[in-house]
Interface confidence: medium
Amino acid sequence: QVPPQYPPIQSIRVQFTRCENEKGCIITSPSKDETMKVQDNSIIINCDGFYLISLKGYFSEELSLSLYYRKGRGPLFSLSKVTSVDSIGVAYLAFKDKVYFNVTTHSTSYKDIQVNGGELILIHQNPGGFCAY
Amino acid sequence: QVPPQYPPIQSIRVQFTRCENEKGCIITSPSKDETMKVQDNSIIINCDGFYLISLKGYFSEELSLSLYYRKGRGPLFSLSKVTSVDSIGVAYLAFKDKVYFNVTTHSTSYKDIQVNGGELILIHQNPGGFCAY
Amino acid sequence: QVPPQYPPIQSIRVQFTRCENEKGCIITSPSKDETMKVQDNSIIINCDGFYLISLKGYFSEELSLSLYYRKGRGPLFSLSKVTSVDSIGVAYLAFKDKVYFNVTTHSTSYKDIQVNGGELILIHQNPGGFCAY
């Protein structure tokens, strides 16, 4: 008898090369094979459970950056007046959550913030839990 | 044929709002659905394997905090004279291990240490390995 | 009916007690039960997907250390002029990749660098994806 295979794990890697003041970072998913989707510049959460979250990037100017998942809830990450980020976290997310950036710069420039190596990875840690597709 | 489902992954999130000098932090599991259990202020390990461990908290006073898993073994985390913690680690734990805190404060106060956002998450990374329930 | 078991997750913990200047760190796998293998001082990647990577160690002298996975690609970790490391990261690795160290010391000593608590852990996060054995 063939041993059972794992169904694909919900995971995604998105990249971002620019962020906008008082908005967020423009995210794109380089792979067509991701098991999670980007919609309206947010990563859509379909499955309840813990997620491993990795966030990296080098910014062209000092900024404050937060990563949110639900209106009215505190951020997953919050970094104040940084020019780079390289952070790992674990958070419990649920169906209907949306993971998105908020960015504030401290300059008066109207220019985009350029980002080198901007990468956000989410990996579901509780396969077998509730999912809604 | 229905694809096989994942059996639930061993994971738990416990919260702590206070710690006691020369003892530990009082942990509670806010969810009834956790796949791991708290007993005698410790998280009980039933399954061998690597665990992803996330530890967060803001303390009302400076303290030294260690997270242990087995008598006679070094700590999973050890932080000296801190007022906050936000750490991620990976460790190999095994059946019969128990994850618990040890705390020392450097004040002569008899009061508990209050904790904001105190959270400890454990997520098993090796489903399919040995478990004893 | 017996619920399906998980096939073993690809994971490994290797230890290293010494590193050589302008070469790497001598890695050994203490367990015979690892699901990943060491070959020519590298960890062999058989399965595509995200990996959780934990790297720890205390070095007998200051060094610069990088952890590579593929010729011509940037490092998974790069630490300059450090005497210790305690880092966690997430990276996408693929079949045929090999994870190995490169070390440079800034002394003229011909001696090996001694390492305390040198440990590298890799844990596959996408079971169900492509593997080649």
Epitope: E20, N21, E22, K23, T108, S109, Y110, K111, D112 | - | -
Partner: antibody, heavy 115, light 112 residues
Framework: EVQLVESGGDLVKPAGSLRLSCVAS????????MSWVRQAPEKGLQLVAG????????YYTDAVKGRFTISRDNAKNTVYLQMNSLRAEDTAIYYC????????WGQGTLVTVSS | DIVMTQTPLSLSVSPGEPASISCKAS???????????LYWFRQKPGQSPQRLIY???NRDPGVPDRFSGSGSGTDFTLRISRVEADDAGIYYC?????????FGQGTKLEIK
Amino acid sequence: EVQLVESGGDLVKPAGSLRLSCVASGFTFSSYSMSWVRQAPEKGLQLVAGINSAGSSTYYTDAVKGRFTISRDNAKNTVYLQMNSLRAEDTAIYYCAKRWVFDYWGQGTLVTVSS
Amino acid sequence: DIVMTQTPLSLSVSPGEPASISCKASQSLPHSLGNTYLYWFRQKPGQSPQRLIYKVSNRDPGVPDRFSGSGSGTDFTLRISRVEADDAGIYYCGQGIQDPFTFGQGTKLEIK
């Protein structure tokens, strides 16, 4: 295909006002900063004003500060340049451009300030 | 403001011949994340400007590989390896590392 279409240029007397519009299509307008660049007759290019994607940060060249106002309506995919207290030296072709690095330009609209 | 000075102000080149335009900044254009925000634009007669090159040496989509950019610090160059009749127009360099974005005065390329 990215398109930027300017309108609103005209002949106007000194101290008069004009409002230029630029309608964008072919990209997610609300995600990008926008700029106005002008070119005086037989002269080079000069950045006049810029606005970030949210409309919360703006830039003006010193020569137009206090007289010109850049704004945007993301629902209408449109960026505006309100020009007051116009002077003869404001005579130019005004181009709308995408982002602060001007990766796409409109065809321009001519503003002539003369009595 | 950073002043961008182009040379020559005009040049006349036969089809198939190379052309080179220089752009000098009044101060060194620093890196930001390894990027230097130096751009080249072309304005054909009666048309709006079009960006050709971004960040010193990267061609915009649709720009032929006959066009190349190079340089660092204060000195930058646009080269056309083999000029064609359609290349006629005014070429501008511009810098975006420091506000405000400033342009060179332009170089007029005529085809003989």
